[in-house]
């Protein structure tokens, strides 16, 4: 029987620009962690595997880094990051646990107050 | 276009060590993890370990953890596999294997090295 | 280390044959299976990963499927240039670790 949950960030937000750190917790069981899958929809972003270490999507290399733990770390980010993220913990003996985080990327606040004041 | 193109043919004495060479190109070296997996004669494929080129970290099968050693040169973008105390065991193709987009496999191999190892 | 049987371990077949290979693993490997066609004097290709997504360039004859334990490798009308060994691997722990092979020639 499954009767771990998984805790995450919740609905976070960023600066244009900055970095975020994606973050899951497997708690409430026993079971060992064995990989755990980070993808953005659809989209492998990382894999962090007990045995083998890390594997980052080479589409995302130039701006993922692993960590910290489990984690993951998003950088440069540009607007087009905001949406859902997933990370899927493999198990054993349990199986697989699901998390989910929403992150929205704002534009920085100098960008704002230097738009609001554009000369036409 | 994807190429990785490995050192020549390597006769080696039992107790030596062996270092072949990968050049990769055709992508960006840095952003793809690389293989290396032997093939004895006749036999069927066994995974050594994989290097991260980027930060040079390693992982090894416990079973050459002891004798075998990957690297990377990146200005060349050419990743290397030494493998030391060899024994008649150890006689078998060498292949370097890019590792894929999506995980631990491999979508890329090189045309492999043979070392044979004979006193 | 996760063990992989393959079946058959060879099998003789005709051009234009529907041929199943199977992949057997010691444990849930998840849909961490690749598959690699090999052709004597060659290097290993790959032809599918995460079990059933098709490698680019690859006919789309080829097909797999399976998860957990078990998968299987189809080969939906055998053409001149599928006559080779073919591997399975999982992609899930260390070490990673390759079936045994299974030889398809002609009938």
């Known amino acids: 029987m499954m009767t771990g949950t998984i805790e995450t960030t919740g609905n976070i937000s960023a600066e244009k620009g900055g970095s975020i750190i994606l973050q899951c917790h497997l708690s409430s069981t026993t079971a060992q962690v064995t990989q755990v899958n980070w993808e953005q929809q659809d989209q492998l972003l990382a894999i962090c595997n007990a045995d083998l270490g890390w594997h980052i999507s080479p589409s995302f290399k130039d701006r993922v880094a692993p960590g910290p733990g489990l984690g993951l770390t998003l950088q440069s980010l540009t607007v087009n990051d905001t949406g859902e993220y997933f990370c899927i913990y493999h198990t054993y003996p349990d199986g697989t646990y699901t998390g989910r985080i929403f992150l929205e990327v704002l534009e920085s606040s100098v960008a704002e107050h230097g738009a609001r004041f554009q000369i036409p | 276009e994807v190429q990785l193109v490995q050192s020549g043919a390597e006769v080696k004495k039992p107790g030596a060590s062996v270092k072949v060479s990968c050049k990769a190109s055709?992508?960006?070296?840095?952003?793809?993890?690389m293989h290396w997996v032997r093939q004895a004669p006749g036999q069927g494929l066994e995974w050594m370990g994989r290097?991260?080129?980027?930060?040079?970290?390693?992982k090894y099968n416990e079973k050459f953890k002891s004798r075998v050693t990957i690297t990377v040169d990146k200005l060349s973008s050419t990743a290397y596999m030494e493998l030391s105390s060899l024994r008649s065991e150890d006689t078998a193709v060498y292949y370097c294997?890019?590792?894929?987009?999506?995980?631990?496999?491999?979508?890329?191999w090189g045309q492999g090295t043979t070392v044979t190892v004979s006193s | 280390d996760i063990q992989m049987t393959q079946s058959p371990s060879s099998l003789s077949a005709s051009v234009g044959d529907r041929v199943t290979i199977t992949c057997r693993v010691s444990?849930?490997?998840?849909?961490?299976l690749a598959w690699y066609q090999q052709k004597p004097g060659k290097s290993p290709k790959l032809l599918i990963y995460?079990?059933?997504t098709l490698a680019e360039g690859v006919p789309s004859r080829f097909s797999g499927s399976g998860s957990g334990t078990d998968f299987t490798l189809t080969i939906s009308s055998l053409q001149p240039e599928d006559f080779a060994t073919y591997y399975c691997?999982?992609?899930?722990?260390?070490?990673?670790?390759f079936g045994p092979g299974t030889k398809v020639d002609i009938k």
């Open positions: 444990e849930n490997i998840y849909s961490y």
């Open positions: 055709g992508y960006t070296f840095t952003n793809y993890y």
């Open positions: 294997a890019r590792e894929g987009h999506y995980g631990f496999y491999s979508d890329y």
């Open positions: 691997q999982h992609h899930y722990g260390n070490p990673l670790t």
């Open positions: 290097i991260d080129p980027d930060s040079g970290g390693s």
């Open positions: 995460n079990a059933k």
